[in-house]
Interface confidence: medium
Amino acid sequence: MQSFNFEDFWENEDFSNYSYSSDLPPSLPDVAPCRPESLEINKYFVVIIYALVFLLSLLGNSLVMLVILHSRVGRSITDVYLLNLAMADLLFALTLPIWAAAKVNGWIFGTFLCKVVSLLKEVNFYSGILLLACISVDRYLAIVHATRTLTQKRYLVKFVCLSIWSLSLLLALPVLLFRRTVYLTYISPVCYEDMGNNTAKWRMVLRILPQTFGFILPLLIMLFCYGFTLRTLFKAHMGQKHRAMRVIFAVVLIFLLCWLPYHLVLLADTLMRTRLINETCQRRNNIDQALDATEILGILHSCLNPLIYAFIGQKFRHGLLKILATHGLISKDSLPKDSRPSFVGSSSGHTSTTL
């Protein structure tokens, strides 16, 4: 194994303005009794989590994609966005076996895979929130302004999706540029960010930009759009449309529950590193532990959307049953009477809501 050259890595890097200590020798009162701490979780437990999420996500998102692609007739705009959402989750899930293996054996896959799987993880998050922001805009235009523009111009939706993937790649670019396999002296190699001599400055710039454009901005768009959408639905007593919106609201709610805690902690970490929040040893350790505790929710998210569709999305269940019946896996008699080959919800005109 190649040995790690300390001079090449983060020279003059000012990681912090505090110091940590391990077990101190007796009677050394002037040494800070603090050391880096993160959650102590058994690596095999982590591997089990990865394996479960991988299997659930692979099965669930494959089915979602199958049902949407199978239902060509009456496929809504939201369906197209959810297809892309499932695609992003599936791509991320495919990297989980690699992360699981790395947890046990260290990063044995080299720099190329290090860059690729890290990129997929970032792209999954950014495309996810940007697609949900687009769904919120689409629902806002359809319900609040009764606009049919997007629905009538499907090429525009394809352009929007392409733009989302491009922007997600752009936001995830720092990972592609700076991640590499780092060979350490006494432990297994790691897939890590090496930004050269200006790590702290780079990390701040490359964290603030994605957090602003890839999290805070889409979040504000979603809050604005769904705020007005809900107000319109309740004011107009549009019960049918409200029911049709249940799945979308559930998808957004689960996304926020899974990703908001992590990104709020990350924001606190960013504020502390930029000295906008006073940095203390206790605070640093609390943030480290919170990052570990909240990141698992983000990982779990990739397998949750199909479960939402299965439990809340009536049309998804119908669509799935239709496919099973088409292939003779179940009797056609067991199909609901109103089952159609898509999972478009009931709503007026071209403003259909998915699942």
Epitope: S19, P36, I187, D292, I299
Partner: nanobody
């Protein structure tokens, strides 16, 4: 968990020599400064010498010309070569290092910590 292990201490006659070694192990990304401190009973510890990753060296006046600090970055090790030892050099010698370590369950992050060894006894006596 990061550990610093010292070795090389012992009993030596005045004018003799000893070589102390300190090896750092664990989830180490990088070691910034490594140094040697000493402490005698009832007194505060004092810095003997330290060396940065860039090779900048600092000694206290009492040991200049007699002690030499060096480090091997590839082995995460710091050495203290002690020549012309005097009875007043008798103390417990502690290794100290400012280390960038990896923390994190899902995503690994770098954090700086200040770590200490358990100490090695150096006795200069005839």
């Amino acid at each position: 968990e990061v550990q610093l292990v010292e070795s090389g201490g012992g009993l030596v006659q005045p004018g003799g020599s000893l070589r102390l070694s300190c090896v750092a192990s664990g989830s180490i990304v990088r070691i910034n400064t490594m140094g040697w401190y000493r402490q005698t009973p009832g007194k505060q510890r004092e810095l003997v010498a330290d060396i940065t990753s860039g090779g900048n060296i600092n000694y206290i006046d009492a040991v200049k010309g007699r002690f030499t600090i060096s480090r091997d970055n590839t082995k995460n090790t710091v050495y203290l070569q002690m020549n012309s030892l005097k009875p007043e050099d008798t103390a417990v010698y502690y290794c100290n290092a400012e280390i960038v370590v990896l923390v994190g369950v899902w995503t690994q992050r770098a954090r700086t910590g200040n770590y200490w060894g358990q100490g090695t006894q150096v006795t200069v006596s005839s």
